[in-house]
Amino acid sequence: KEEQTTFRDCAEIFKSGLTTSGIYTLTFPNSTEEIKAYCDMDVGGGGWTVIQHREDGSVDFQRTWKEYKEGFGSPLGEYWLGNEFVSQLTGQHRYVLKIQLKDWEGNEAHSLYDHFYLAGEESNYRIHLTGLTGTAGKISSISQPGSDFSTKDSDNDKCICKCSQMLSGGWWFDACGPSNLNGQYYPQKQNTNKFNGIKWYYWKGSGYSLKATTMMIRPADF
């Protein structure tokens, strides 16, 4: 049997026998275009494609629509994988989304959505989520129904303001909503009463800016 040489996601890589976490090359569905992603092969059985990670504020997340579309940062550290790749990938098969969060007091929590996909660019990469479970709040901190994606140069929110400019970062802003994992990074002891921080309201409440976040996806049938 011929060995698979291209992989659409980290689940395929894991199933091929490569079970060490790290950076791998993925291929866009129905294309030869490639993208580098961090694969988490340890959490909850492995096979997770990391689509966002924050940990130290080393990467500026106040980026343009094009940058969020194509991705930025380093898969070994802070990065955004890219809306176009995630949209194409999640449009092909059913994916789950796991969001892992860390606060500054040493606590960890997660939210798991049993179905996640992004619409195409023509629909502003609108997020679709169902089936929330986990420890980071019984209510979804990503507004439901899902919002369009907005950036500093593409305002698609439901606010009289421009949420991306007011809060910083590209996100599925509502008006502006209970979350923004791409907000301004604040260090410990400077992370409360923040209007533009890394927010997940239904876990840590208002104005609390988190220490670390990871968004990762995996096929539902993994």
Epitope: C159, I160, C163, A175, C176, P178, N193, F195, S206
Partner: nanobody, 129 residues
Framework: EVQLVESGGGLVQAGGSLRLSCAAS????????IGWFRQAPGKEREGVSC????????YYADSVKGRFTISSDNDKNTVYLQMNSLKPEDTAVYYC??????????????????????WGQGTQVTVSS
Amino acid sequence: EVQLVESGGGLVQAGGSLRLSCAASGFTLDDYAIGWFRQAPGKEREGVSCIRDSDGSTYYADSVKGRFTISSDNDKNTVYLQMNSLKPEDTAVYYCAAVPAGRLRFGEQWYPLYEYDAWGQGTQVTVSS
């Protein structure tokens, strides 16, 4: 650094009055709405009143309409809540909180709780019968 400090709470008899103050620093009231919230033991935090200086708008919960009055002093960067005809059911910890004034949904006048990102530590109000 954004800070909100409440004061003016205390113990008062039913029918009495109190004036709460919320002193804001690190931002100016012109660009923000300030809300007063309260939380009684074992209950959810609830909105009491809100003021938006940019257009002079005020909001009151039905339970306090006609009894409470919200106002602001821009020179002192302070918001006040005058509470008259107090009832035992007004007993709670009272908090003030701030939200950027523009963070409003199209067609709406006021803000969900999760939009208020800066909070004070609270002041206790106890109304005895």
